[in-house]
């Protein structure tokens, strides 16, 4: 019951992290114009990851799409790219951590698969998590930087090179949606990855011992014969001795963390 | 069409108050931003303030702040300058105008005439 | 405040020929998120509320005839009548849209010669 409303409520909470992590990415406060030397101004300035808006006293907002890619930051191109893989790992790891939810039943599917889909969903959220931390993380030390690097602009216009105060960015509501959402689905994640160690079957009266043959990497189980590869754990994870023979969890291939870079 | 009708004129003794009314039609009331300007006889355009008729919020000219008051009651589309403290100086034509793209002041009304005299 | 001057204070120009009114700004109009120049003009005629010829330095409001035109960048601005027509006798007032408050040039009376 424990591990069902644990994965249940990691589930939810990665649900709301991605939800969080798409809603930061579209959105167009990423950073806002500075308002403390002047905080009541006729124009507004913010900007997203995909484009800037300028918001007039008077109501009206003007926007304009990034429509160059080789002319922007290279640190903007790499926010960009950490929040969609965070977004796409987020969606595969929703994807299948719906088919691995204990209250869901599809088929025959067994504890030992839902344990394992339920692992890897709960490792893709947490990178999709770290991912989402990492791009709003870079960004605003973008800003930082930006912040006091910025003092006076030169700019040319119609009447000739004309001195203007540069507009200084500050971070913007994206920036802590994005945070928050990050953080969230890094919890979900670990407490799916939490959930994935109860998953297995209840224990037997006997201890399942993969006896490694010389041959063949064949794990035989007692009571039964019933062969399996050593892939997806049927049982808990504990130690039985330190010599040859070893629990089917300790055999199991965990992904790397170069698996999803 | 958007029009902008203001009260009549008044004439008011010094230290006296003055509330001009700015009645709008032909467009949502809440749409736009509307700013007070003033007009001195045979002077330049000497801007009030503006009131955001959709949250109420206010901007003031630091000339007028404290003696100036800007209201707007959505049910009526109506807006409302009260000027206080009233002095022979603020003898003017006051004209409510809509603020549109650009911050520009698109629509104006014809004018109140405020006469402030003992 | 972002102070406004107008230059000349009056101006005659004879009917058909090229009117050139300038406005100077104490402080850049530009905004760097848009790079548009919040300059407007207006002509106000005797008796009658001030009318919006040009907003954004140099866009057109809809209806205004294109011989007037709006030019400058930064904290020089000028608005060019190509043309002067009998119905454009009147004041023309430069505004600065982009910070509080907004100011008003002190107008620039234009007459014909």
């Known amino acids: 019951m424990a591990v069902t409303a644990c994965q249940g409520l990691g589930f939810v909470v990665s649900l709301i992290g991605i939800a969080g992590i798409i809603a930061a990415t579209c959105m167009d406060q990423w950073s806002t114009q500075d308002l403390y030397n002047n905080p009541v101004t006729a124009v507004f300035n913010y900007q997203g990851l995909w484009r800037s808006c300028v918001r007039e006293s008077s109501g009206f907002t003007e926007c304009r799409g990034y429509f160059t890619l080789l002319g922007l930051p290279a640190m903007l191109q790499a926010v960009r790219a950490l929040m969609i893989v965070g977004i796409v790992l987020g969606a595969i790891g929703l994807l299948v951590s719906i088919f691995a939810l204990k209250c869901i039943r599809i088929g025959s599917m067994e504890d030992s698969a839902k344990a394992n889909m339920t692992l890897t969903s709960g490792i893709m959220f947490i990178v999709s998590g770290l991912c989402a931390i990492a791009g709003v993380s870079v960004f605003a030390n973008m800003l930082v930087t930006n912040f006091w690097m910025s003092t006076a602009n030169m700019y040319t216009g119609m009447g000739g090179m004309v001195q203007t105060v540069q507009t200084r960015y500050t971070f913007g509501a994206a920036l802590f949606v994005g945070w928050v959402a990050g953080g969230l689905t890094l919890i979900g994640g670990v407490m799916m990855c939490i959930a994935c160690r109860g998953l297995a079957p209840e224990e037997t009266n006997y201890k399942a011992v993969s006896y490694h043959a010389s041959g063949h990497s064949v794990a035989y189980k007692p009571g039964g014969f019933k062969a399996s590869t050593g892939f997806g754990s049927n049982t808990k994870n504990k130690k039985i001795y330190d010599g040859g023979a070893r629990t089917e969890d300790e055999v199991q291939s965990y992904p790397s963390k170069h698996d999803y870079v | 069409q958007v029009q902008l009708v203001q009260s009549g004129a008044e004439v008011k003794k010094p230290g006296a108050s003055v509330k001009v009314s700015c009645k709008a039609s032909g467009y949502t009331f809440t749409s736009y931003v509307i700013n007070w300007v003033r007009q001195a006889t045979g002077q330049g355009l000497e801007w009030i303030g503006e009131?955001?008729?959709?949250?109420?919020?206010?901007y003031y000219s630091e000339k007028f702040r404290g003696r100036v008051t800007l209201t707007a009651d959505t049910s009526i589309s109506t807006a409302y300058m009260e000027l206080s403290s009233l002095r022979s100086e603020d003898t003017a034509v006051y004209y409510c105008?809509?603020?549109?793209?650009?911050?520009?002041?698109?629509?104006w009304d014809q004018g109140t005439t405020v006469t402030v005299s003992s | 405040d972002i102070v406004m001057t107008q230059s000349p204070s009056s101006l005659a120009v004879s009917l058909g020929e090229m009117a050139t009114i300038n406005c100077k700004s104490s402080q850049s109009l530009l905004n760097s998120g848009n790079q548009r120049n919040y300059l407007t003009w207006y002509q106000q005629k005797p008796g009658q509320p001030p009318k919006l010829l040009i907003y954004?330095?140099?866009t057109r409001e809809s209806g205004v005839p294109d011989r007037f035109s709006g030019s400058g960048s930064g904290t020089d601005f000028t608005l060019t009548i190509s043309s002067l027509q009998a119905e454009d006798v009147a004041v023309y007032y430069c505004q600065n849209s982009y910070n509080y408050p907004y100011t008003f040039g002190q107008g620039t009376k234009l007459e014909r010669k």
């Open positions: 009131i955001h008729p959709r949250g109420g919020n206010t």
């Open positions: 105008a809509i603020l549109r793209r650009g911050n520009a002041m698109d629509y």
């Open positions: 954004w330095a140099s």
